[in-house]
């Protein structure tokens, strides 16, 4: 047995006579035998769920669902009641409508087994019927939704009439109907104005059913209708097989160049048109189990289930269903020399369908595992400025397909034929697994000896030794001027182009900054900055190269605090900057203000305490303080 | 607040070695280059030696270079400068300073450590 | 390296006073300067930076100015506290090299 509603209202007046009947409550049937039986809760209910009194008022018929007033509800009673209600005005009272033989303890009221029946008080007596509105003499102030189990016996789920009206204004005349009505599985008894279900409902047909209740009112001469929606929710059960969309039931898959922990190999979809079990089940009741195979496929892969609702249509609406995608997913690493194919299966299994048929499917992947050789090109050739900064970037190498790595470890490192003469470091990239060139030793680009530098390019892979070389030829370019003691380290340190231009900072491949001139538009990722190389910084991503020294680029890779309008990048930098950004790497600093403040104004303001407001710089609100502001503002 | 605290000088005979020490608090050492600057008694300052923040680059003048060795311990906050084959005209204070890489001047200096060749 | 000349060597002046001091660069050295402050016994204290930026802290009766190759510090009216010794410092080249100093005497 089940409630067709988790909660009902109606209007309690002070001193409603004895008897009067106040609402019916209705339970239908999971199974034809059954009969329910109403049995109140003990206790009224009042503000945050506070226990204000034994219910002495009202009863229930137990066979009927009928609630009335055992007796009247006097200023003094309610006065009791309201003295009891946490200092809060007692507007609204509720009650627990048990379902026996459901749980004959008071505890939580969860639907199906228990209902809430919320009273709404008036502290004075029930109105002159001649003063009721026709909204008033229809329905309730709060709108009724139902639920409905599909499958389930048909039966009575509500009672149009108020009956508090109709036992204290016998002569005003109301009827009801349903409107869309026709041709649905409900019906509205002329007589009783009963609502019931003429069938038993499938959800998979019809889910939601937007009812419209009409309510005529003849008061004497004049008649009235008033309108409001009536939506019947039908709810699910496990009713439904899991199926092959399409009948595709196996998945082919290389795996070649993405051997990564975690990469998924291979995806099958299973349509199930059941909502349940509810996600917080759904994972524990619809299982799937990769088939034993040998000991290697079941270390290396694993199987995740991938729930989603989703919608279908029938019979002109649509209904939710599920779709289940069954991922085969790597469980480790694949060594590059790994070679293999195999064929696995995967059983899902629907526990809570109870047939016809079976709430069972067989998945099939097909894998072949390729090994992966390690090539580089048979020579490279690039060129480099003497007035480099140490950690400029200058080129890179690349085994063949290294961009569509991953789970694939490739070193690489350089071996020079001239020891004087190394200049240049390589560090491998997480992103691509190239190796990024670049200037590790400014002293030796300076030797005139070292015109021309001669590298072996290794590359590596250390789980299976394999290698691959390419030979690195390097030509020095240009004449050396000798770097400004003066000039700040860190490009990023310069709030403005001409001072920006006229230094050079770590990471420049041509020993002076670049000056990045930004849109303008608010808070932009593309805000001005002065930078060693505007190719690589800022890019919004710290590369391997800038997080050996933060004076490379603060901009992508700062993880202190950021001054001014700022979206702060994940997980360090500035994503978006207002205006004009500078750092200072060594206090662990960025600002970013707009772009045509002036100097004067700026130390004007530093010598109080410097507001930059929501309103100017579209930020969160940042207090800059003289001390933030040292060094700065001169700058 | 920086503080700078230099250790190690004293009394030497010319040709022999001293090591000073420059201990460092109050800010975060590791991002700061370092100098070290003389003062013989009763003359102007005279610049023996910078280190770059991480070690990675040394310069010295004329006057001590092949001699002096400028290095760093970054985990001790500590700058050192070795100083062989000393010479009577090395006689002088001798100043630890401090250069923010963003601004390069001489922003913070020690109180000095006297060093006297003698024989 | 660069020599940096200082004038003049000594200079005697009474508290109230206006008193510029002069350091003249061999080769340009752009903005970058430093003049420092230093008493009997006391390690050099900055008073400006970059030729012409007040270090913080500094009374504004210090002022710096010039780029290039001439450059002034100036102190707009003497208090007892500035008689000392001050010393140009060029940053421009790693080279580091100073002024030989001005003393400033009351006269």
């Known amino acids: 047995l089940y409630f067709s509603r988790d909660a009902y209202w109606e209007k309690l007046y002070v001193d409603q006579p004895a008897g009067t009947p106040l609402l019916y409550v209705h339970a239908l049937r999971d199974a034809p035998e059954e009969v329910p039986s109403f049995r109140l809760g003990q206790h009224l209910y009042g503000t945050y769920r506070t226990r204000l009194h034994e219910n002495n008022w009202i009863c229930i018929q137990e066979d009927t669902g009928l609630l009335y007033l055992n007796r009247s509800l006097d200023r003094s009673s309610w006065e009791k009641l309201s003295g009891r209600n946490r200092g809060f005005p007692l507007l609204t009272v509720y009650l627990k409508v048990f379902l026996s033989p459901t749980s004959l303890r008071e505890g939580e009221c969860q639907w199906p087994g228990c209902a809430r029946v919320y009273f709404s008080f008036f502290n004075t007596s029930f109105p002159a019927c001649t003063s009721l509105k026709p909204r008033e003499l229809c329905f309730p102030e709060t709108r009724p939704s139902f639920r409905i189990r599909e499958n389930r016996p048909p039966g009575t789920f509500h009672q149009f009439r108020l009956l508090p009206v109709q036992f204290l204004c016998p002569n005003i005349s109301v009827a009801y109907r349903l409107l869309e009505g026709e041709g649905l599985p409900f019906r509205c008894a002329p007589d009783s104005l009963e609502v019931s279900t003429r069938w038993a409902l499938d959800r998979e047909q019809r889910e939601k059913y937007e009812l419209v209740a009409v309510c005529t009112v003849h008061a004497g001469a004049r008649e009235e209708v008033v309108m409001v929606p009536f939506p019947v929710t039908v709810y699910d059960e496990d009713d439904s097989a899991p199926t092959f969309p399409a009948g595709v039931d196996t998945a082919s898959a290389v795996v070649e160049f993405k051997r990564k922990e975690d990469t998924v190999v291979a995806t099958l979809r299973v349509f199930d048109a059941d909502v349940v079990p509810a996600s917080g089940e759904l994972v524990r009741r619809y299982t799937s189990t990769l088939l034993p195979g040998d000991t290697w496929t079941q270390q290396t892969f694993r199987v995740e289930h991938w729930p989603n609702e989703t919608s279908v249509q029938a019979n002109g609406s649509f209904v939710r269903a599920t779709v289940h995608d069954y991922r085969l997913v790597l469980n480790r690493n694949l060594s590059i020399s790994e070679n293999r194919t195999m064929q696995l299966a995967v059983l899902v299994n629907d526990s809570d369908f109870q047939g016809p048929g079976a709430g069972v499917l067989l998945l099939h992947f097909n894998v072949s595992v390729l090994p992966v050789s390690l090539h580089l090109p048979s020579s490279y050739s690039l060129s480099v400025s003497r007035r480099a900064r140490r950690f400029a970037q200058i080129g890179k190498v690349c085994v063949e397909n290294c961009q569509a790595f991953s789970g694939i470890n490739v070193q690489y490192e350089l071996h020079s034929s001239g020891a004087n003469c190394s200049t240049l470091g390589v560090v491998t990239s997480a992103e691509d697994t190239s190796g990024i060139l670049f200037v590790n030793d400014t002293k030796a680009l300076r030797r005139p000896k070292c015109a021309e530098l001669h590298y072996m390019v290794v590359a590596t892979n250390h789980q299976t030794s394999r290698q691959a070389q390419a030979q690195l030829l390097v030509t020095v370019e240009g004449l050396y001027v000798a770097e400004e003691a003066g000039c700040p380290l860190s490009c990023a340190v310069s709030k403005r182009r001409p001072e920006c231009e006229e230094c050079g900072g770590l990471g420049s491949p041509t020993g002076r900054c670049e000056w990045r001139q930004g849109d303008g538009k608010g808070i932009t990722r593309n805000f001005s900055t002065c930078s060693p190389s505007t190719k690589t910084c800022p890019d919004g991503h710290c590369d391997v190269v800038e997080t050996q020294d933060i004076n490379i680029c603060p901009q992508d890779c700062l993880r202190g605090s950021i001054v001014g309008g700022h979206e702060p990048g994940e997980p360090r930098g500035i994503k978006a900057g207002y205006g004009t950004c500078n750092c200072f790497p060594e206090e662990e600093k960025c600002f970013c203000e707009p772009e045509d403040i002036q100097d004067p104004l700026c130390d004007e303001l530093c010598r109080e305490q410097k507001l930059i407001s929501e309103e100017d710089l579209g930020g969160e609100q940042k207090l800059i303080s003289e001390e933030d502001l040292h060094h700065h503002h001169h700058h | 607040q920086v503080q700078l605290v230099e250790s190690g000088g004293g009394v030497v005979q010319p040709g022999r070695s001293l090591r000073l020490s420059c201990e460092a608090s109050?800010?975060?050492?590791?991002?700061?280059?370092m100098h070290w600057v003389r003062q013989a008694p009763g003359k102007g300052l005279d610049w023996v030696s910078t280190?770059?923040?991480?070690?990675?680059?040394?310069y010295y003048s004329d006057s001590v270079k092949g001699r002096f060795t400028i290095s760093r311990d970054n985990s001790k906050n500590t700058l050192y400068l070795q100083m062989n084959s000393l010479r009577a005209e090395d006689t002088a204070v001798y100043y630890c300073?401090?250069?923010?890489?963003?601004?390069?001047?001489?922003?913070?200096w020690g109180q000095g450590t006297l060093v006297t060749v003698s024989s | 390296d660069i020599q940096m000349t200082q004038s003049p060597s000594t200079l005697s002046a009474s508290v109230g006073d206006r008193v510029t001091i002069t350091c003249r660069a061999s080769?340009?050295?752009?903005?970058?300067l430093t003049w420092y402050q230093q008493k009997p016994g006391k390690a050099p204290k900055v008073l400006i930076y970059?030729?012409?930026t007040l270090e913080r802290g500094v009374p504004s009766r210090f002022s710096g100015s010039g780029s290039g190759t001439e450059f002034t510090l100036t102190i707009s009216s003497l208090q007892p506290e500035d008689f000392a010794t001050y010393y140009c410092?060029?940053?421009?080249?790693?080279?580091?090299?100073f002024g030989q100093g001005t003393k400033l005497e009351i006269k």
């Open positions: 080769q340009s050295i752009r903005s970058w």
């Open positions: 970059k030729a012409s």
């Open positions: 410092h060029q940053y421009s080249s790693y080279s580091y090299t």
């Open positions: 280190i770059y923040y991480d070690g990675s680059d040394e």
């Open positions: 109050g800010f975060t050492f590791r991002n700061y280059g």
């Open positions: 300073a401090r250069d923010p890489p963003s601004f390069r001047y001489f922003d913070y």
